[in-house]
C-alpha cells in the first residue's frame, strides 16, 4: 500500500494509504488491536459500588474506588480507551472499607493521551482518496485518587 | 516524502519515510511534540517526600503520593512518557498528612499504553534506507493508589 506524508492535517505529518471506498485492511489490523483498561474490567457488583473491597482488581480495592467506561472510536488509534469514573465523592475508610471519610476527596486523575485519528487528506477527491493519520491529544481520566482537600490561601 | 506500509515490523503495518542518514524533519516534528505528565511536574520538596500536601498538584495531595520520572526515547511516539514512583509504602493518614497508616498500601497502577517506534524497514540497505512505524504496547505506571491490602483466601 502506497503512503505519503501529508502536511495538511493540522500541520502534522501523517500517513495516507490509498484506498477504494473503504480504508485498507492494514488500518483495520492496526487500529483494532485492543488495549485493555489498566485493571481487568469487573462485572461484579462491588466494582460499581462505593466501597473498598479486600480482593479483586486495584480499582475496587482502592479507597477511592472507580469503574471503567469504554470509549470506542473506529477512526482512532487506539480504538478503545477507558475512562475512570469515581464511585464515591469522598474516600472510603481504611478501617471499614465502606463508610466515607469527609477528610478525603476522591477525585479523577486526568491525562492528555496521544492518539491518532484517520482523516481524509486535504485536496484528495474521488473514489481513490487517501487517508491522513492525524496526531491529537485526548483527555482521559486514568484513575481516582484519594486526596486531602485543597486549602484555599 | 514518500512512504509505504511495511508488514515486516512485528507483523504490524507501518509507515516508512525515505531518508538520507537522518530521519526526516517530519519525524522530528511529529515525535517531539511534548506530552506533559497528568499533573504538572513539581520541583518543590514536598512532592518528593512521603507526605500528603494540602496544596499543589494531585500527586502531592494524594494520600498515596508519587513523583513522576521522565522516560524519553527519541525513536518513539510519544517521545516523552512519565512513570509514577510511589513515595510511601503505606497510605498517609488523612488526619495528619504525614504519618503512615499500615491499614492501607500505596501501590502503582500500571497500564499498557500504545506507542510507536521508528525502526529500519526489513530488507532496506544503503544510504536511502526507510523507517517503519511499529506499534507496540509499553507498560507505564500511571499513578499510585491507596488500597486495602488483599486478603488471601
Amino acid at each position: 500500500v502506497s503512503l505519503r506524508i501529508q502536511e495538511g492535517c493540522s500541520h502534522l505529518p501523517s500517513c495516507c494509504p490509498s484506498k477504494e471506498q473503504e480504508p485498507p485492511e492494514e488500518w483495520l489490523k492496526w487500529s483494532s488491536a485492543s488495549v485493555s483498561p489498566p485493571e481487568p474490567l469487573s462485572h461484579t457488583h462491588h466494582a460499581e459500588s462505593c466501597r473498598a473491597s479486600k480482593d479483586g482488581p486495584l480499582n475496587s480495592r482502592a479507597i477511592s474506588p472507580w469503574s471503567y467506561e469504554l470509549d470506542r472510536d473506529l477512526n482512532r488509534v487506539p480504538q478503545d480507551l477507558y475512562h475512570a469514573r469515581c464511585l464515591c465523592p469522598h474516600c472510603v475508610s481504611l478501617q471499614t472499607g465502606s463508610h466515607m471519610d469527609p477528610l478525603g476527596n476522591s477525585v479523577p486523575l486526568y491525562h492528555n493521551q496521544t492518539v491518532f485519528y484517520r482523516r481524509p487528506c486535504h485536496g484528495e477527491e474521488g473514489t481513490h482518496r487517501r487517508y491522513c493519520l492525524e496526531r491529537r491529544l485526548y483527555r482521559v481520566s486514568l484513575a481516582c485518587v484519594c486526596v486531602r482537600p485543597r486549602v484555599m490561601a | 516524502v514518500s512512504l509505504r506500509i511495511q508488514e515486516g515490523c512485528s507483523h504490524l503495518p507501518s509507515c516508512c519515510p525515505s531518508k538520507e542518514q537522518e530521519p526526516p524533519e517530519e519525524w522530528l516534528k511529529w515525535s517531539s511534540a511534548s506530552v506533559s505528565p497528568p499533573e504538572p511536574l513539581s520541583h518543590t520538596h514536598h512532592a518528593e517526600s512521603c507526605r500528603a500536601s494540602k496544596d499543589g498538584p494531585l500527586n502531592s495531595r494524594a494520600i498515596s503520593p508519587w513523583s513522576y520520572e521522565l522516560d524519553r526515547d527519541l525513536n518513539r511516539v510519544p517521545q516523552d512518557l512519565y512513570h509514577a514512583r510511589c513515595l510511601c509504602p503505606h497510605c498517609v493518614s488523612l488526619q495528619t498528612g504525614s504519618h503512615m497508616d499500615p491499614l492501607g498500601n500505596s501501590v502503582p497502577l500500571y497500564h499498557n499504553q500504545t506507542v510507536f517506534y521508528r525502526r529500519p524497514c526489513h530488507g532496506e540497505e544503503g544510504t536511502h534506507r526507510r523507517y517503519c512505524l511499529e506499534r507496540r504496547l509499553y507498560r507505564v505506571s500511571l499513578a499510585c493508589v491507596c488500597v486495602r491490602p488483599r486478603v488471601m483466601a
Epitope: S32, E69, L70, D71, R72, N75, R119, P120 | -
Partner: antibody, heavy 120, light 108 residues
Framework: QVTLKESGPGILQPSQTLSLTCSFS??????????VGWIRQPSGKGLEWLAH???????QYNPALQSRLTISKDTSSSQVFLKIASVDIADIATYYC????????????WGQGALVTVSS | QIVLTQSPAIMSAFPGEKVTMSCSAS?????MYWHQQKPGSSPRLLIY???NLASGVPVRFSGSGSGTSYSLTISRMEAEDAATYYC???????????FGGGTKLEIK
Amino acid sequence: QVTLKESGPGILQPSQTLSLTCSFSGFSLSTSGMGVGWIRQPSGKGLEWLAHIWWDDVKQYNPALQSRLTISKDTSSSQVFLKIASVDIADIATYYCARIGPVHHGFPYWGQGALVTVSS
Amino acid sequence: QIVLTQSPAIMSAFPGEKVTMSCSASSSVNYMYWHQQKPGSSPRLLIYDTSNLASGVPVRFSGSGSGTSYSLTISRMEAEDAATYYCQQWTSYPPMYTFGGGTKLEIK
C-alpha cells in the same frame, strides 16, 4: 451481499415488552470492528438511535432509554435482538437494524424496517 | 448531548441546479455522516467521515465541513434526488449517535 431484516410482533399492548430480531447475512459479527445497531423512526418524524452491540459483546445504549433496553446477539445464527420493556404509545415507530463499522460510525447497511404498533 | 440542527427544513430545486444543505452541531464534532431517505424506504448512507462517498453513491454528492458546521452538496439536482436528508454524528464518550431533524428536498 450484505442484507439485514427486522422481525417483531407488529402489535402489542401498553406495558408489554417488545422483542425485535435482526437477521443478517453477508458479514460476521465476530469480525473485529463490526457492530449492529437499532434505530427507530415514528411515522413522519426523524431517526432516533436506540442501542448497538459490537463484535466483542460490548453493548452501548441511548442514555434516555437505557433503563428499558436490552440488546444481545447470537453470532452463530447471525442475529441481534432488542427488548424494550414497558412499551407505550410513544414507542410506536418503524424499527430498523443497521450495520456499523468496521471502519467508521456511519450506518452503511440498513434493514427494511419493522413497524411496531402499541394499542390497548 | 450534542444536538444537530438541519437547515432548511424544506427546500426545492430545479433539475440541474446546485443544492446545498447545512447541519449545525451544538458543539464540535469529529465527523459527520449523511443519509438519504425516500418515502416508504429505509435510509441510505451517502457520505461517511464528513466527505467520503459511500459505495454506489453518485459523484454529484459531496460532503464538507468541520467543527460545528457541515454541509451536503448535490452538484446537479436530479429527479431521483428528491428525498429527506439526515445528518448524523456520534460521540465516543459517552457513546451517543445523534441524527438531525432532516431536510426535505423536493424537485421543482
